[in-house]
């Protein structure tokens, strides 16, 4: 792949440059000073002079006045004003109003309830693959595998819980060590990132939304991958997360809890349990090698069971393969002992549209994949729809100011603490990490909060999520409370060590400019998106996987070299960037590399190639659509579905993204038409609250 | 109702064999195991082997292994046991017994043989 | 073998009364006890099975306890009818084994 996508006939600018206050600021920015605000009761940011190694040269000429692409659009408000209004108008606004409201919240419970179906479709996809993946030997000598087999699983069940529950229900009973299963551990919280990131493709519409949208999804990827590329190395050789974890364990006598509260669930679970019930104890015996699981079916038939525990006389070779001596006996001719059996019988039926279809599990999986992906998409853009309308002129001020907004000096370092608090306790609140980042993933896109808030939040729905974790440990049976509680412990110092390596330090906020910068690539290559989640999420873990199945040896001698280029491109990138003149002439920039190796844009004409022919057809499909829509609504500007179409003709324009050196990865000048920016539509009567 | 018939009393000569017969009616021949238990005069009990009739497969007391010969006849539902080269000591009453089923308790016992050994 | 070993021998008792027999086994039997009644002259009838459950048509005053070595059996008033010789048996392990019998007299 091409070191750094589009690197043409870049020139290190050894002139210092102009950027937006904004724009390096690693801490949400005080939105009062922003850029392209047309409120004229905010004035235009001053720009500052940054040396190159604050902020690294970049590798093009850059135009003095930047209009940064990571700047929170002003939603314009076309409406007539509160005070303009009569009585009537009033009263219409205001049940307007509460309509929004109602249908914010319908299509909010519906996205939630689309994810729980998505997690279970991929569980009936790929959940016997993904037990299977646990009950390789190999994971207890090769930490690397096992941190792939987590991202596996994970992205597979598209449930951190569901493979954290079975490494838990592994340990306990002995088939794997703690020390094996922290490893296992890491990668289902890489894993567990991709379901927003997936979220934030359904904004692919709209270029300057999607590039925040996405970058905010993916702002959870790198934060994970980042955490594991140094602690798991730390932790091979240290062993301090299973030590730490070990004394806390061992020191404390803990007593059962109970169930950390359901409280989303209870909402969602009465529809879902409509569309799919799962039976997941499957994934976990498969994990377990217990053969007879790997013929049953995921999808539960019957809820409502009667166990009856008998014990039953059994005939024995001898007496040595009795149960224990006081359980055995003879009928003068046989051996006998006692054997307690569990006698399932089937009641009640499940309430769910597949109890009857009897369908295998791929088929319900894949049915039910495409389902909750088009609810999920239709949710999303009707959610993004309602907050425009919503979010406009006052209205938006005032949240985006609340949301954004860093505490006065000298207490503006606390924000971010907050906002990982505040993270936590909703993730804790909605028992899911997922949950929590996918609805947070519109509001990015939409620009109501910004990537440098939405990561301390995305880092404090990381430590909910474990402590849901913990709380589900507390309410483990005794066996299990100790190996349970000990890999929650695991997993939340894990995420507890990633903050302190990733926050605290505005520049080591490393994933936030890595997310900035995909999001500008994302922008301008949409497919690269896609391309990004099949390698990171899928690709590189299979790539590991396959070979540590081969042994040490073969994952060494493909993996040392592969390691030694990216460290090299790494330091060649950093010294063209901080100090070029140290290099050859020719090491100075990328040109000696052929285009397909330093930029996207040939990449980009044979994926076009590729879905030119689709799209076109999904474009005439859109339009169709659109004007069916138009009609039904009344409203002629409203309906941007055909914006694709217009992209068509857009992708045929010429720019290039401007890319700059490696640890910049933000404010990446992109014009206006590079970014498909569109006004914001002047519907006939929009209500503005304040 | 379950019914265990033996056969008549004996008198036989050292050295020689008997064989005894136990007719059985009212239940599943083939299904519980069929017990012979010796009672010497004034003595207790004492369980010589078992025959499961569904397979014929049998298991001694090694006291009586090689003296007492189990066998059962589906057809007729009749067990049989033959007891050879008779010495004094082998005079007592033999009681056939059907074993309750999976474990080694009697429920209904024949009325005995009585087996004489005398020169 | 397991050896069973029964007491008392012998014992005089009124109509009445309440009557206890035991039975000591030389290893770990579990529950694998049987006791049988045995009047002159006739077949052995099966009282109690598993140590402590009673068999179809056995009269309530009958009862037995016990487990692992040590087994009872109780008789909880005696009825002119319940004079015979009583005997425990173990059906732990080959070959079953019977206790020498308790045999209760009238007094």
């Known amino acids: 792949m091409a070191p750094w996508p589009e690197l043409g006939d870049a020139q290190p600018n050894p002139d210092k440059y102009l950027e937006g206050a904004a724009g390096q600021q690693p801490t949400a920015p005080d939105k009062s000073k922003e850029t392209n605000k047309t409120d004229n009761t905010e004035a235009p940011v001053t720009k500052i002079e940054l040396l190159p190694s604050y902020s690294t040269a970049t590798l093009i000429d850059e135009p003095t006045e930047v209009d940064d692409p990571w700047n929170l659009p002003t939603l314009q408000d076309s409406g007539i004003k509160w005070s303009e209004r009569d009585t009537k108008g009033k009263i219409l606004c205001f049940f307007q109003g509460i309509g929004r409201l109602i249908l914010l919240l319908g299509f909010l419970y519906f996205f939630v309830c689309s994810l729980d179906i998505l997690s279970s479709a991929f569980q009936l996809v790929g959940g016997k693959m993904a037990g299977q993946f646990f009950s390789n030997s190999s994971i207890m000598s090769n930490p690397l595998l096992g941190l792939v087999i987590g991202v596996l699983v994970t992205v597979l069940v598209q449930s951190s819980s569901t493979s954290t529950s079975i490494v838990v229900s592994m340990v306990s009973s002995s088939l794997l060590t703690v020390r094996a299963a922290i490893p296992i551990i890491m990668g289902a919280n890489i894993g567990t990132s991709i379901t927003n990131t997936i979220v934030a493709l359904m904004q692919v519409g709209d270029r300057s939304e999607f590039r925040r949208a996405f970058a905010g999804a993916t702002v959870h990827d790198f934060f994970n991958w980042l955490s594991v590329l140094v602690l798991l190395p730390v932790e091979v050789a240290t062993h301090y997360l299973e030590i730490i974890t070990q004394l806390i364990v061992e020191s404390f006598h803990f007593k059962n809890g109970e169930d950390a509260p359901d409280l989303l669930k209870v909402i969602t679970k009465p529809f879902t349990k409509l569309i799919v019930q799962l039976d997941k104890k499957v994934i976990s015996q498969i994990a377990m090698n217990d053969e007879k699981a790997k013929n049953k079916s995921l999808v539960k038939i019957w809820c409502k069971t009667f166990t009856n525990k008998t014990q039953i006389n059994v005939t024995v070779p001898s007496t040595a393969n009795c149960t224990s001596p006081s359980l055995c006996w003879t009928d003068g001719i046989q051996n006998w002992t006692m054997k307690n059996v569990t006698y399932k019988e089937n009641i009640a039926k499940c309430q769910h549209i597949f109890v009857n279809f009897h369908l295998p599990d791929l088929a319900v999986g894949t049915i039910l994949l495409i389902l909750s992906l088009l609810v999920l998409c239709g949710c999303l853009i009707m959610i993004v729809k309602i907050l425009g309308s919503v979010l406009k002129g006052q209205v938006a001020t005032v949240i985006k100011k609340t949301i954004n907004t860093d505490f006065p000096f000298p207490f503006a370092w606390l924000t971010g603490y907050l906002a990982i608090l505040v993270g936590a306790g909703m993730t804790f609140i909605v028992q899911s990490s997922s949950v929590f980042t996918s609805a947070l993933t519109p509001l990015i896109g939409i620009g109501v909060i910004t990537i440098e808030r939405a990561y301390p939040l995305t880092l404090g729905s990381n430590i909910g999520t474990t402590t849901t974790a913990i709380l589900a440990a507390l309410a483990s049976p005794g066996n299990a409370l100790r190996s349970s509680l000990q890999i929650a412990l695991c997993h939340f110092f894990f995420n507890i060590s990633g903050i302190l390596l990733w926050y605290p330090i505005p520049f080591t906020r490393l994933p936030i400019r890595m997310a900035k910068g995909l999001g500008n690539i994302s922008a301008k290559y949409r497919w690269f998106a896609v391309f990004y989640l099949i390698i990171f999420f899928f690709l590189i873990p299979l790539t590991v996987f396959g070979l540590s199945l081969a042994g040490w040896r073969v994952l060494v001698g493909v993996g040392v070299p592969v390691v030694f280029i990216i460290i090299l491109v790494l330091c060649l990138r950093l010294l063209q960037s901080r100090c070029p003149r140290v290099l050859p002439k020719k090491l100075q920039n990328w040109n000696f590399l052929p285009l397909w190796m330093r930029s996207l844009k040939p990449w980009d004409a044979v994926v076009s190639k590729f879905t030119g022919c689709f799209q076109m057809r999904c474009c005439c499909c859109c339009r169709v659509c659109c004007r069916a829509c138009c009609l039904l609504c009344d409203c002629p500007k409203c309906c941007r579905c055909s914006k694709c179409c217009e992209d068509l003709e857009e992708a045929q324009e010429g720019q290039d993204v401007p890319v700059k050196a490696p640890e910049t990865f933000d404010n990446i000048t992109i014009s206006r038409e590079a970014q498909g920016e569109v006004p914001a539509s002047d519907s006939k009567t929009e209500c503005t609250a304040l | 109702q379950v019914q265990l018939v033996q056969s008549g009393a004996e008198v036989v000569k050292p050295g020689a064999s008997v064989k005894m017969s136990c007719k059985t009616s009212?239940?599943?021949?083939?299904?519980?195991?069929m017990h012979w238990v010796k009672q010497a005069p004034g003595q207790g009990l004492e369980w010589i082997g078992a025959i499961y009739p569904g397979s014929g497969a049998t298991a001694y007391n090694q006291k009586f292994k090689g003296r007492a010969t189990l066998t059962a006849d589906k057809s007729t539902s009749t067990a049989y046991m033959e007891l050879s080269s008779l010495r004094s000591e082998a005079t007592a009453v033999y009681y056939c017994?059907?074993?309750?089923?999976?474990?080694?308790?009697?429920?209904?016992w024949g009325q005995g043989t009585s087996v004489t050994v005398s020169s | 073998d397991i050896q069973l070993t029964q007491s008392p021998s012998f014992l005089s008792a009124s109509v009445g009364d309440r009557v206890t027999i035991t039975c000591k086994a030389s290893?770990?039997?579990?529950?694998?006890v049987a006791w049988y009644q045995q009047k002159p002259g006739k077949s052995p009838k099966l009282l109690i099975y598993w140590a402590t459950t009673r068999h179809s048509g056995v009269p309530d005053r009958f009862s037995g306890s016990g487990s692992g070595t040590e087994f009872t059996f109780t008789i909880s008033s005696l009825q002119p009818e319940d004079f015979a010789t009583y005997f425990c048996?173990?059906?732990?392990?080959?070959?079953?084994?019977f206790g020498q019998g308790t045999k209760l007299e009238i007094k």
């Open positions: 017994a059907r074993g309750m089923y999976g474990h080694g308790a009697m429920d209904y």
């Open positions: 290893q770990d039997v579990g529950t694998a």
């Open positions: 009212g239940y599943t021949f083939t299904t519980n195991n």
């Open positions: 048996q173990q059906y732990s392990s080959n070959p079953l084994t």
